[in-house]
């Protein structure tokens, strides 16, 4: 069957009928509807929205909404024994404590079960001792302390103040280089953005706000008690010391007011740069400890959170395709927030609302997709993933045979400047082309395309008259799919202008400040950011579920293959002497590449030829494109990062958030002059350019004739 | 990485000629395809032409056949495009760029990019 025999209308109609099916008003309602209390993961209110969410999308149209339950390790502060940082005197005596809670956003006051802030999956203690400020705790912050500034953080409680890597990450760092307890703190210099008022008056962080979230690094495991397998009803657990990616000491976050009372009377060591100051009035010396006066003065923990197995609900909804109902193309978003979820998620669930409810909209005139579409509502995103992963783990065998790709939709909004889009490079072209068609939301745009504003606000790296389109890292639910799986996958939302506004993230992601209020009010007044919003992620799970070649381009993946390689090799080529010593050579894997770009020319040259009235090569084709992600998987995974099996891409082992390009070379070369085995790292270099160069190579040959 | 640097443009009158030359750094020049691309104002970047990395195969967009050469010289990391016939329509900031495939018309499958050069063609 061809994709017209599937419907009642035109393919060229479908998709703008699709489109003009998608509100603005709608997507508000949704959102207002979505934010009026707290939906923590494994919480009653959480089961109820998904009860909610599953009525709804059957409403709409679906063909099937079911709840997917999972019962996983999740952490929450204790009720009647809260978590709190103090300064204490010789006599142990605690002279100031820092705040059990935000203060409630106008119109909130009397809500309850806010959860206050806390670093989730902390273990419990009580550590006191001198502090140590590391700026933002990444890699390059402990070299700079320990390896030039000599300082030793052994013993101590590290200050680091958020934003730049993973949370995850900070703690990863401080607890390797020794430190007892970690605070973790918003600096305005990070979090306000000059000429903007605090919450309620803009969007700004005031000095109360705290940054909640987890600070796990599991490494794409998912629930931490079952990793690889699903935590389902006869699901055989770890033990807590053997669960994945738990920290081992006390975690806390806070707002600037209190980092201030901390900050302000440390003493030790100056700042060794201007990068390490913030906005604050205070020296942002290093330490250890506090200033002269100060000096017989103390910090002191205060962490009683609990880890404790918890149910979760996803909700997947199925609309079947009529041709290929076995290829499904999956969009999901998680549900679950920290408290409002103002932006995160429910700017992207009130999205996803809405192209159900679009997609039903057609169905119930008699159409269906070519392919099968899936949706998804993850529970538990903020807890490390674990919704979409343990689905993932459940149904894998389905999805490495059957997914051809996954869109994600979290946050629609993180700024109103321009678009942000992060994909496999099969999906550069359907992002341009569909971008191209889609009118700019953006003042000074009017009757241009989305195309247009995104390439002149947002534009390539490498070529001006094309958009910035970003590698996947984590830190979000396509991560199983991508990095596990290998599914094709992407992610598109609106954000900030990153030249003029250099805070991490937006101001009060995580905050109790996120509501439906600062949305409506300051980001996205007639929500035409998250219409457009809508429009991309909704229109390339249309095109990739109803066109009848699916419209990937590997001769995009030959580029970036390219790309990569080249800059490996000048990483390496840093240490010509050592590279001439261990015979270390890049040309396997420069052959590869071309090898690659030939195969991927004449696949690319076959694909505009070929009868596509025949479904038997039409069926062929498509597997090859779909399966070409999925070859990149290595079974084996990376070094230590055995849920991690992409060669080509993997989240950075410094940051989860950013995607790092050959991974494993990546990582076998970094650092490596301070190596106490030159011979065994180089080696190591050696042995990924080795699977680096096989895997392009074979993902290579699955492109070629088949017979 | 490869940085491009082209030169050659100027004001020249229908029917004459002009050769623009690219230079890249790097000692790697022969392994990348290059192209030359255009861009008229107010108009989407245009393919010309492309040439292999050995220099043994070239790639030539209809409207320039025959009146436009591409050609390089990989000892001196230079790689050239000889217009001849010129029309007004050819007017145009043109950009070298290098890539992985002399096929490849497309600009999102270029890899490096100069920062071009104008070409005025006078009526």
């Known amino acids: 069957k061809s994709s017209n025999e599937a419907t009642n209308i035109t393919p060229k109609h479908n998709m703008k009928a699709f489109l003009d099916e998608l509100k603005a008003e709608n997507i508000k309602k949704f959102l207002y509807n979505f934010t009026q209390i707290p939906h923590l993961a494994g919480t009653e209110q959480n089961f109820q929205l998904a009860k909610q969410i599953q009525s709804q999308w059957k409403e709409f149209g679906l063909d099937s909404v079911e709840l997917a339950h999972y019962d996983v390790l999740l952490s929450y502060p204790n009720k009647t024994h809260p978590n709190y940082i103090s300064i204490i005197n010789e006599d142990g005596n605690e002279i100031f404590n820092t705040s059990l809670f935000e203060p409630p956003p106008p119109g909130y006051e009397n809500v309850s079960d806010i959860v206050p802030p806390f670093s989730a999956f902390s273990p419990q203690g009580m550590p006191e001792g001198d502090l140590v400020y590391v700026n933002y705790a990444r890699t390059e912050d402990f070299f700079k302390l320990e390896r030039d500034m000599k300082i030793n953080c052994s013993g101590k409680i590290v200050i680091a103040r958020y934003g730049k890597v993973f949370r995850g990450n900070k703690v990863k760092n401080a607890q390797l280089a020794g430190a007892k307890g970690v605070i973790l703190y918003s600096d305005p210099a990070d979090y306000f953005a000059p000429g903007v008022k605090s919450y309620p008056d803009g969007w700004n962080l005031p000095g109360g706000g705290v940054q909640r979230g987890n600070i796990l690094n599991l490494n794409g495991a998912g629930d931490p008690l079952t990793p690889g397998y699903p935590a389902n009803e006869y699901a055989y657990r770890r033990g807590i010391a053997e669960a994945v990616g738990l920290p081992s000491i006390p975690v806390h976050p806070i707002g600037y007011y209190d980092a201030q009372k901390l900050l302000e009377k440390m003493g030790g060591s100056a700042p060794p740069d201007s990068s390490w100051r913030g906005s604050l009035k205070v020296p942002y010396n290093v330490g250890p400890g506090f200033t002269g006066n100060f000096s017989t003065q103390k910090v002191k923990m205060h962490i009683h959170s609990t880890n404790e197995v918890t149910r979760i609900y996803n909700v997947i909804g199925t609309l079947r395709g009529a041709v290929e109902p076995d290829r499904y193309v999956i969009l999901g978003g998680h549900r679950d927030s920290w408290v409002f979820g103002g932006i995160d998620p429910q700017s992207g669930a009130a999205v996803v609302h809405e192209i159900v409810r679009s997609f039903g909209t057609l169905k119930k005139e008699g159409w269906r997709p070519r392919r099968t579409i899936l949706f998804a509502s993850w529970d538990a995103e903020e807890f490390g993933l674990l919704g979409s992963t343990e689905w993932a783990e459940e149904n894998s065998r389905l999805l490495q045979e059957r997914g051809v790709a996954y869109i994600n939709a979290d946050s629609s909004i993180e700024g109103n400047y321009t678009l942000r889009v992060d994909c496999t490079p099969l999906m550069y072209s359907l992002v341009h082309n569909l971008t191209k068609e889609l009118k700019s939301p953006d003042e000074g745009f009017e009757g241009k395309s989305l195309y247009e504003s995104w390439t002149k606000k947002s534009p390539s790296p490498e070529f001006s008259g094309m958009p910035r389109i970003s590698k996947l890292g984590s830190g979000n639910d396509f991560e199983v799919f991508f990095q596990r799986l290998g599914i094709a996958s992407g992610r598109a939302r609106y954000t900030k202008n990153w030249e003029t506004n250099k805070f991490s993230g937006y101001p009060l992601y995580h905050s109790v400040y996120e509501t439906y209020e600062l949305v409506e009010k300051f980001y996205d007044p007639m929500f035409k950011y998250h219409l457009t919003v809508a429009q991309v992620r909704g229109g390339m799970v249309f095109e990739l579920a109803n066109s009848i070649v699916l419209p990937f381009d590997c001769r995009d993946y030959a580029v970036v293959l390219r790309k990569y390689a080249d800059k490996i090799y000048s990483i390496s080529m840093k240490h010509p002497q050592e590279m001439k010593t261990y015979s270390v050579s890049f040309d396997s894997l420069f052959s590869a590449v071309k090898n690659f770009t030939e195969i991927a020319s004449k696949f690319s040259e076959r694909l505009q030829d070929f009868d596509k009235s025949n479904p038997i090569v039409l069926r062929m084709m498509n597997d090859q494109l779909m399966f070409l992600e999925r070859a990149f998987i290595d079974p084996l995974g990376l070094p230590d990062r055995p849920f991690y099996r992409h060669v080509i891409y993997a989240p950075s082992s410094h940051n989860k958030y950013a995607g790092e390009s050959f991974p494993g070379i990546y990582d076998a070369l970094f650092d490596i002059e301070s190596k106490v085995d030159p011979s065994k790292a180089w080696g190591e270099v050696k042995r990924q350019i080795y699977v680096a160069a096989f895997t392009v190579q074979a993902a290579a040959e699955t492109l070629s004739e088949v017979a | 990485e490869v940085q491009l640097v082209e030169s050659g443009g100027g004001l020249v009158q229908a029917g004459g000629s002009l050769k623009l030359s690219c230079v890249a750094n790097?000692?790697?020049?022969?392994?990348?395809?290059m192209a030359w691309f255009r861009q008229a104002p107010g108009k989407e970047h245009e393919f010309v032409a492309a040439?292999?990395?050995?220099?043994?195969?070239?790639n030539n967009a209809d409207s320039v056949k025959g009146r436009f050469t591409i050609s390089r010289d990989n000892a001196k990391n230079r790689v050239y495009l000889q217009l001849n016939s010129l029309k007004p329509e050819d007017t145009a900031a043109y950009y070298c760029?290098?890539?992985?495939?002399?096929?490849?018309?497309?600009?999102?499958?270029?890899?490096?990019w100069g920062q071009g050069t104008q070409v005025t063609v006078s009526s």
């Open positions: 760029a290098a890539g992985v495939h002399h096929t490849y018309t497309i600009p999102r499958l270029w890899l490096y």
């Open positions: 040439i292999t990395g050995d220099g043994d195969t070239t």
């Open positions: 790097g000692p790697t020049f022969s392994t990348y395809a």
